[in-house]
């Protein structure tokens, strides 16, 4: 596949298990594949009744859904969980629900946060 | 509903090069979901072989990437797998699934699976 | 490549009972994992995807759950076609890779 047009190098990392999974809460992501992989951000969010939860942010390897797109939208209709892909450091801060059949465009903004850098 | 069905020579000489069809039936092979090979030797756990996705993009398990080739026919519905240079140790069931449009939606649909005996 | 390790290679169990199989990851896999059931001669059947989403059409007698690096399915009363060997498999990496499976036998 090659490394994309966007290179991925960075991405918004989130883990709302983070004490279960020993990990940190919130902070950014250094990404890492082998050279032929191509790399991009992701995030993934649950919406119980119109409230958000988001569950997941990070890097997220070599997926065909994800290639040459800036934004991170997810546009399947009412999946049990959201997920939305893209390419470019820190690309996932903001991610939208557009889905495919129509519908309104929802933007979810991230809250202000201090970064703490992951590798 | 949707079915896969695997097609091919169940017996391929040591050498020789494996191939195998899954047609594709009640789904459209262009939606943008991931098509899967996956193995299995006889008596022994699940192995994954490759993807392709219908704009032609391949992954492929590096432990068997110098030998595999798998390509779609959007025309036909269908689409395959060449392993080349088999030997004994690719002797297995092989099946064909369709994955989600994400990988981690998981293997939702599966054919019935092929077996392949690698023999002279 | 992420290594999945399952645990037990086997159980005996009688119909009705609670069966809880493991799967651990060599590393994080965050919650990116599904579990299928397989029995002989058959094509392996997905019953859950992103460690807690069960398919459409699987009883809800099965479950997952865990995140990270450990992972559990759990059949709350074992049925008869409960008998059948598990596997578990992780998404986020390629390869694809695969548990080496649970076989549940009737004691």
């Known amino acids: 596949s090659g490394r994309g047009e966007a290179e991925t190098r960075e991405c918004i990392y989130y883990n709302a298990n983070w004490e279960l999974e020993r990990t940190n809460q919130s902070g950014l992501e250094r990404c890492e594949g082998e050279q032929d992989k191509r790399l991009h951000c992701y995030a993934s969010w649950r919406n119980s009744s119109g409230t958000i939860e988001l569950v997941k942010k990070g890097c997220w390897l070599d997926d065909f859904n994800c290639y040459d797109r800036q934004e991170c939208v997810a546009t399947e209709e009412n999946p049990q969980v959201y997920f939305c892909c893209c390419e470019g450091n820190f690309c996932n801060e903001r991610f939208t629900h557009l889905p495919e059949a129509g519908g309104p465009e929802v933007t979810y903004e991230p809250p202000p946060t201090a970064p703490t850098l992951l590798t | 509903q949707v079915q896969l069905q695997e097609s091919g020579p169940g017996l391929v000489k040591p050498s020789e090069t494996l191939s195998l069809t899954c047609a594709v039936s009640?789904?459209?092979?262009?939606?943008?979901?991931?098509w899967m090979w996956i193995r299995q030797p006889p008596g022994k756990g699940l192995e994954w072989i490759g993807s392709?996705?219908?704009?032609?993009?391949?992954y492929y398990n590096p432990s068997l990437k110098s030998r595999v080739t798998i390509s779609v026919d959007t025309s036909k519905n269908q689409f395959s797998l060449k392993l080349s240079s088999v030997t004994a140790a690719d002797t297995a069931v092989y099946y064909c699934?369709?994955?989600?449009?994400?990988?981690?939606?998981?293997?939702?649909?599966w054919g019935q699976g092929t077996t392949v005996t690698v023999s002279s | 490549d992420i290594q999945m390790t399952q645990s037990p290679s086997s159980v005996s169990a009688s119909v009705g009972d609670r069966v809880t199989i493991t799967c651990r990851a060599s590393?994080?896999?965050?919650?990116?994992l599904a579990w299928y059931q397989q029995k002989p001669g058959k094509a392996p059947k997905l019953l859950i995807y992103?460690?807690?989403n069960l398919q459409s059409g699987v009883p809800s007698r099965f479950s997952g759950s865990g995140s990270g690096t450990d992972f559990t399915l759990t059949i709350s009363s074992l049925q008869p076609e409960d008998f059948a060997t598990y596997y578990c498999?992780?998404?986020?990496?390629?390869?694809?890779?695969f548990g080496g499976g649970t076989k549940v036998e009737i004691k």
């Open positions: 699934a369709r994955a989600g449009k994400y990988r981690w939606h998981g293997m939702d649909v």
């Open positions: 009640g789904y459209s092979i262009s939606s943008g979901v991931y």
């Open positions: 392709i996705v219908h704009s032609g993009h391949t």
């Open positions: 590393q994080g896999i965050s919650s990116w």
């Open positions: 992103a460690a807690s």
């Open positions: 498999q992780q998404a986020p990496d390629l390869p694809i890779t």
